[in-house]
Structure formats: C-alpha cells, structure tokens
C-alpha cells in the first residue's frame, strides 16, 4: 500500500519509516472509519505539519517548511487512511512525527519515527601521485556515516585511512589506500546501514602486455559475475593514462545500448558486448600508446575497475632505419 | 463516564478579574478541544473561546478578545478561563463544553453545569 | 460573523405533533450546523451535527435538513418531554455563532 519507504513496526502505536534524501515518502496512519474526521499531523509534538477537517485541508498554520509539500489520501480518509505523503525530504525532517485522528467515535494518536538516508553513489578512483599509485573510494554524500572495508586479495585491511568533511545535511568521505608496486586484487565495500544499501569497487591489475610497433592488442574487461547484474544499468569506460591523468577512449551506456568511440583505432565487438564482455582492441599500434588502460565497469551498487599495463616498443624495422 | 466541572463564578466589580476553572473525567483530556459558552440571564447562548487538544492553538469571540484568555493543564485535567476589565455584559453562566474532537470541529458534544458570574458595582 | 436566524420564535403545539424550526444563516455555512435542547435550568444537550447527523443517545423522532443557508429540524412525534428551547449554532467559522434560540411549548 505503501510504496515510497519502508517501515517497520514496533510497539505503542509507533512506526519507523525510512527516506532517502530529496525522495518522496508515506508517513503511515490508519484509524476505524467514522464520520466528522479531523487530522493534524504534527512534528516532535510542535511543528504543525498538516490539518485536516470540516471536509478540507487547514494549512493556514502550518509550519513554512512543510509548505507545499504535505498532502493526504483524500479519497481514502473516509476508508480510514490518515496516512501523510510528504515531499522531498530532507535530513531536518528526521524527527518523530504525531498523527492525531478524532472522529465521532474516537480519538487516536499515532507516531510515527522518520529516519532519512543519503547515499548518492560512490566512486572508485585510480590516480598516480608522482611515483605513488592510489586507489581512492568516496562518497559525495553519504547519510549516516558509513562503514568502509577494504580487501586486498579478498583478505580485510585494518589500516583505513578515512578523510571525512561534514555538511549541514551529510558526510563527503575519501578513503585513499597506496597500492604502489602492488599487483594485488583490491576490494572496497561502502555499506549504509540505514538504507540497507552496499557498494562495492574492486580493482584488477592485468599482466603487462609487450607489443611491437604497429601491432594490435586485446585488452581483457570482463564483470566478476558476483557483482554483475546485468538487468541493472551500468556504463563502461576504456581511458587511458598518460602524464597522470585518464583520457577516454570509448564508453558505452547499457540503458541505450549507445557505444561511443572517440579514438578511432579502438574497436569493441559488439557481440562480445552482448554477452557482457567489454574486452577491447587497439590497432596499428605506437610508441606513445604505452602506458596504463583502465576499463570501468560501473552501476548504482559497484565499481570494476580492471588495469592494463601496455609497452610499445619499436619494430625491427623501425630500429634498422635509425 | 465524562463529566466537566466549572468553577469560579461570583460577583465582581466592572474593571476587575475573574478566574472560572473547569475540571474534566471521564474522557482523555488531552485528546479533546474545550470551549467557554456563556448565556446571559434569560438569553441565548454565545460562544466565547476554544483551547485545542494540546493547548497551542486558542481563538475567541471578538466581544472578549483581548480581555479573556483560555489556557488548560493536561497533566492535571484542568481548563481555565482568566477573565479582566469585566464588563456589566458579561454578565452570564458560563459553560465549559468539550468538542467533538480536537477542538478543530467546532460543536459541543458534553457540556458542564455552568458557573454564574456576575458584574455588578 | 455569521449570524443565525431561527424561525419561529416561540412555537405551541400538541404531544404527537409534527414540529419544525427553522435556521437560515446568513452566507452559507455548507452543513456545518448543530442543533442543541436546552431544558430550563440546564446546560443544553446536542442533538444534531453536520446538519442531519443524529447524535448518539438522542431519541430517531429528532432529525435534522438542510444546506447552505437553509436548515430545519423536525420532530416527528412531540413528547412531553420535548419542552425545551432549540437552538441552532454554525461551526463552519470562528466565531462560532447560535440563533437566537426557539422555545417550545406543550399545549
């Protein structure tokens, strides 16, 4: 019945119900059905959230901050639904909120506990710092402050360096972890308790790969299945570094099935694509394509990160005309 | 079963104060709204102020806005209606008479015995 | 204010009679009107809401019509214990307003 949050119920008339930031959500309320209904909601027992009586709303002392942003079921008030829907909430919503239902046969008084949560999703980042490589998980806004783990071979970190800034309303948080000389598999998890909501970045390095001047070469991408979820959207990005920063070879956006190529010696194959491979060739190769490859797999729930080590070195032929 | 009890009532000169109280059971007070209703001797009835179920909310008539002003105690089951500059026109039983609900309704389903007051030099 | 309008003022008539006030407010006030007994020497007693609701307790010869600014109360079958004054009120605005009030004698 009600689609917008989730709730649990515990004792005395009280409810727990759970938004997310800038969300919509149903504050539940129901009562036996009688005639002459009068509804006020009310927040932390002072705040005038929303009235109801005499057939029609009463909103001329209503809390500003509630403004345009609280109404009822209209049509099922008389089946006995108080519930409120409530607009876009904020962290300042959080509070207890007080459904009082008199009719002409009863008074009853409902609370109901909202509890909002913030995770906007969180990204994995590989970033060279002079002759350090770091690998950085953050989240922009995260409400309330998460837990962060991190694996290295599937076998947890201790060490976990938090770099935290509090807002009015969340917390931005970057958890770098140097990586430098590694080839070990890397994995972060960001876990917000509240929203029940996990995400996971995982970073692989390949081999390196060795190829001659004008050759061509298939650079592996492929989702580890426990993640990968393929009715879910997700996009990939094929970069590649050079002098510290990523340039973008190609992406591709599973919601429109749109590839979009910008470095024309690159080519994906789409039927590999359908099959959720993402490996990618690089034609007619040259000194200066050396360097480090990076495809991203990302969706709402994770990060997959997979390095190529490319070194281009000249062909025979090459070294003869010098 | 509910019952509302006024008291308080009296003579008392023009220009003075008055303090009537109303005593309520039988019924959660907190969850009801509570009137003042006044009938001048051989009169009709006149409405005179509400106080809502949590006390934040209070509206009166416009004959004693101003002088009059309604207040209750919860915890203690108690209304109150704090009278100054009596006029000779107030002159009247006051009723104390529980709302439907709220206080947002607006009629007076139980009402007390009433309290004469009376404003006389 | 709203002001409240009851007809007749003083009305007579017979145990068993059919009896009806009239109420007219003077802008319309939707159904938003009570009707109250008022037996001499006590507080009145509420025997209609929203215009034709029958309060609980209240005997079914007592009913109630009307909406807007028209409103009537009948009683089908008048019983001694009828004498009383009537009093209409409209909740639909503060100030809450009554009519003046109808008293009713037994013949």
């Known amino acids: 019945i009600f689609p917008l949050a989730f709730f649990i119920y515990v004792p005395m008339n009280e409810q727990i119900v759970i938004g997310r930031l800038d969300e919509d959500i149903i504050l539940p309320s129901s009562f036996e059905r009688g005639s002459e209904v009068v509804i006020h909601w009310k927040y932390q027992d002072s705040y005038k959230v929303h009235s109801y009586y005499k057939g029609s709303d009463h909103l001329e002392s209503q809390d500003p901050r509630y403004a345009n942003r609280t109404s009822l079921f209209y049509n099922e008030i008389q089946n006995g639904n108080a519930s409120l829907f409530f607009r876009r909430v904020s962290l300042l919503d959080e509070g207890i909120y007080t459904c009082y239902v008199g009719t002409a046969i009863q008074v009853i008084t409902n609370k109901v506990v909202l509890k909002v949560g913030v995770f906007l999703t969180p990204v994995m980042k590989y970033e060279k710092r002079n002759t350090n490589s770091f690998l950085i998980c953050s989240v922009l806004s995260v409400y309330p402050r998460p837990i962060i783990t991190w694996k290295m071979d599937n076998t947890p970190i201790s060490e976990n360096n938090m770099e935290e800034t509090g807002s009015l309303d969340s917390f931005s948080i970057n958890s770098p972890l140097n990586i430098t000389g590694s080839n070990s598999s890397y994995e972060c998890t960001i876990e917000n308790s509240l929203l029940k909501q996990t995400w996971t970045g995982r970073w692989t390095m390949k081999d390196g790969l060795h190829k001659m001047q004008s050759e061509h070469v298939s650079l592996s991408c492929q989702p580890v299945n426990d993640y990968f979820s393929p009715n879910q959207d997700f996009k990939v990005t094929w970069s590649r570094m050079k002098s510290g920063t990523f340039s973008v070879l190609a992406y591709y956006l599973s919601s429109s099935q749109n590839t979009i190529i910008n470095e024309s010696r690159f080519s994906w194959n789409k039927e590999l694509i359908n099959q959720s491979d993402f490996s990618m060739n690089l034609m007619d190769l040259n000194l200066s394509d050396s360097g480090e490859y990076l495809c991203n797999i990302s969706s709402d729930e994770y990060t997959l990160l997979t390095i190529h080590t490319v070194h281009v070195e000249p062909s025979q032929e090459t070294a003869s005309h010098n | 079963q509910v019952q509302l009890v006024e008291s308080g009532g009296g003579v008392v000169q023009p220009g003075r104060s008055l303090r009537l109280s109303c005593a309520a059971s039988?019924?959660?007070?907190?969850?009801?709204?509570i009137h003042w209703v006044r009938q001048a001797p051989g009169k009709g009835l006149e409405w005179v102020a509400v106080?809502?179920?949590?006390?934040?909310?209070?509206y009166y008539a416009d004959s004693v806005r101003g002088r009059f002003t309604i207040s209750r105690d919860n915890s203690k089951n108690t209304l109150s209606l704090q009278m100054n500059s009596l006029r000779v026109e107030d002159t009247a039983v006051y009723y104390c008479?529980?709302?439907?609900?709220?206080?947002?309704?607006?009629?007076?389903?139980?009402w007390g015995q009433g309290t004469l007051v009376t404003v006389s030099s | 204010d709203i002001q409240m309008t009851q007809s007749p003022s003083t009305l007579s008539a017979s145990v068993g009679d059919r009896v009806t006030i009239t109420c007219r407010a003077s802008?319309?006030?939707?159904?938003?009107l009570a009707w109250y007994q008022q037996k001499p020497g006590k507080a009145p007693k509420l025997l209609i809401y929203?215009?034709?609701s029958l309060e609980s307790g209240v005997p079914s010869r007592f009913s109630g019509s009307g909406s807007g600014t028209e409103f009537t109360l009948t009683i089908s079958s008048l019983q001694p214990d009828d004498l009383a004054t009537y009093y209409c009120?409209?909740?639909?605005?503060?100030?809450?307003?009554f009519g003046q009030g109808t008293k009713l004698e037994i013949k």
């Open positions: 008479a529980r709302d439907r609900s709220s206080g947002a309704m607006g009629y007076f389903v139980y």
């Open positions: 039988g019924f959660t007070f907190s969850d009801y709204g």
């Open positions: 106080i809502w179920y949590e006390g934040s909310d209070k």
């Open positions: 802008q319309s006030i939707s159904s938003w």
């Open positions: 929203k215009a034709s």
């Open positions: 009120q409209q909740y639909n605005a503060y100030s809450y307003t």
